[in-house]
């Protein structure tokens, strides 16, 4: 016979029940009734044995990160709770989830705080006048880095080649520009935009298309057309790794990029 | 050796305040959580009031909560009970025990009490 | 709050016999994550403060003698004291933690014909 409701504990994780779409942050409170004079405080997941895998831990007034940077743990103000919070979700992070402390001498003993449950659903698609979110995952860095200097260079070729054909269709045209259409009117995603990987390429964002955009007719018949490379409208600021973005968003922040959920 | 000594009891009378003490020593008194449990004549025994470590989390049952205090003071390895508005119900022998298993609230070690009776 | 009902109020038996105790609580102490059950039981002997003999229901503290034994889960408890000594004559007292407020039961006195 169980009891239908917790016992009193030590540790406390909550909330018991988390649902997350895939892509979120999905953030547990591990809090302490009183903090002992030496402790670790480790963040577990239940393995399908039901055997505990430590995600992170906290000792010492320092967080120790497990193999996956996703898991963080963080100590906050009052000093006896943490936040213990996955980087965008994923689905099979769903599972059953514990804090537990080690005491240290003098009196070495081991408390584990009920369990909590985290669901992660499948990220349901939304209007495109909704926020964007974070894509599910990518299929490796390597791959986006190829992708997107593949996806660099075929831009830059085509844009060589408009200019080129231009020339060779205006031969007469010799200054001058018209710019056609709205300056403030945003520069429409079809559809059919493929997503953009993260690039450490320094201050600019890329935007990669399957489709380039035809070229805007003349607005007079011996003006030169001059091609023009997009910018998004928000500047990259200084020293700051600039992400290529997507119809589903971009990437969620990595642990060195910046305050975050990471204790500095 | 584990030792914990209580003092303060007395008669006082009903409505009136009465601060218990219990001094430990024997052990690391800042790492343990602490309670006082009463026992009234010749009946069973009640808990009172319990503390954790530093004193930053207190418990109470609702009989004397909002009328009793516990309270610590690590630096002097001392713990109190502070009872205001006392109840001829509240006539007892006073025990200031340890819970050692930290985060547990069973008791390894009991004082051997303190008398308090409240009388007009 | 969870009642603890101890069952006899007392009972006398000759030295060397084994007499058992029983406590009730009104509700499961058993929590299943960890398979503990959050009861424990105390000694206390005339004109003296009470003792920890057994805490997670079965789990004898240090220097208490073997013939005293815990066992049960759930909702039903007993003490067992496989051979009783003079010594023995005491009231045993039930306690949960499994929930504030703490809880005893109202004793079981044990007394050596």
């Known amino acids: 016979l169980d009891s239908p409701d917790r016992p009193w504990s030590p540790l406390t994780f909550s909330p018991a029940q988390l649902t997350v779409q895939e892509g979120e942050n999905a953030t547990f409170t591990c809090s302490l009734a009183d903090i002992p004079d030496s402790f670790v405080l480790n963040w577990y997941r239940l393995s399908p044995r039901n055997q505990t895998d430590k995600l992170a831990a906290f000792q010492e007034d320092r967080i120790e990160p497990g193999r996956d940077r996703r898991f963080r743990v963080t100590r906050l103000p009052n000093g006896r709770d943490f936040h213990m919070s996955i980087v965008a979700a994923r689905l099979n992070d769903s599972g059953i989830y514990l804090c537990g402390a080690i005491y240290l001498p003098p009196n070495t003993q081991i408390n584990e705080s009920p369990r909590a449950e985290l669901s992660v659903t499948e990220r349901t698609l939304e209007p495109p006048t909704q926020s964007p979110s974070p894509p599910p995952r990518l299929s490796g860095q390597l791959q986006g880095l190829v992708i997107g200097v593949t996806s660099v260079l075929v831009g830059v070729l085509l844009l060589l080649l408009l200019t080129w054909v231009l020339a060779a269709v205006f031969p007469r045209a010799t200054r001058g520009a018209c710019v056609c259409g709205s300056e403030d009117e945003p520069l429409k995603e079809g559809p059919d935009a493929a997503p953009v990987f993260t690039l450490d390429y320094g201050e600019l964002d890329f935007q990669w298309r399957e489709k380039t955009p035809e070229p805007p007719a003349p607005c007079a018949p011996e003006q030169t057309e001059y091609a023009t490379i997009v910018f998004p409208g928000r500047p990259a600021s200084p020293g700051r790794r600039a992400s290529a973005s997507s119809l589903q968003g971009a990437q969620p922040p990595s642990p060195e990029d910046g305050p975050g959920l990471w204790p500095p | 050796e584990v030792q914990l000594v209580e003092t303060g009891g007395g008669l006082v009378q009903p409505g009136r305040s009465l601060k218990l003490s219990c001094v430990a020593s024997g052990f690391t008194f800042n790492n343990y959580w602490m309670t006082w449990t009463r026992q009234a004549p010749g009946k069973g025994l009640e808990w009172v009031a319990s503390?954790?470590?530093?004193?930053?989390?207190?418990y109470y049952p609702d009989s004397v909560k909002g009328r009793f205090t516990i309270s610590r003071d690590n630096a002097q390895n001392t713990l109190y009970l502070q009872m205001n508005s006392l109840r001829s119900e509240d006539t007892a022998t006073y025990y200031c025990t340890s819970a050692l298993n930290w985060g547990y609230w069973y008791f390894d070690f009991w004082g051997p009490g303190t008398m308090v009776t409240v009388s007009s | 709050d969870i009642v603890m009902t101890q069952t006899p109020s007392s009972q006398a038996v000759s030295a060397g016999e084994k007499v058992t105790m029983s406590c009730k609580s009104s509700?499961?102490?058993?929590?299943?994550?960890?398979?503990?059950?959050?009861l424990a039981w105390y000694q206390q002997k005339p004109g003296q403060s009470p003792k920890l003999l057994i805490y997670w229901a079965s789990t004898r503290e240090s220097g208490v003698p073997d013939r005293f034994i815990g066992s049960g889960s759930g909702t039903d408890f007993t003490l067992t004291i496989s051979s009783v000594q003079a010594e023995d004559l005491a009231v045993y007292y039930c306690?949960?933690?499994?929930?504030?407020?703490?809880?005893f039961g109202s004793g079981t006195k044990l007394e050596i014909k």
């Open positions: 509700q499961s102490l058993l929590y299943s994550e960890n398979k503990k059950n959050y």
């Open positions: 503390i954790t470590n530093s004193g930053v989390s207190t």
């Open positions: 306690q949960q933690y499994y929930n504030f407020p703490l809880t």
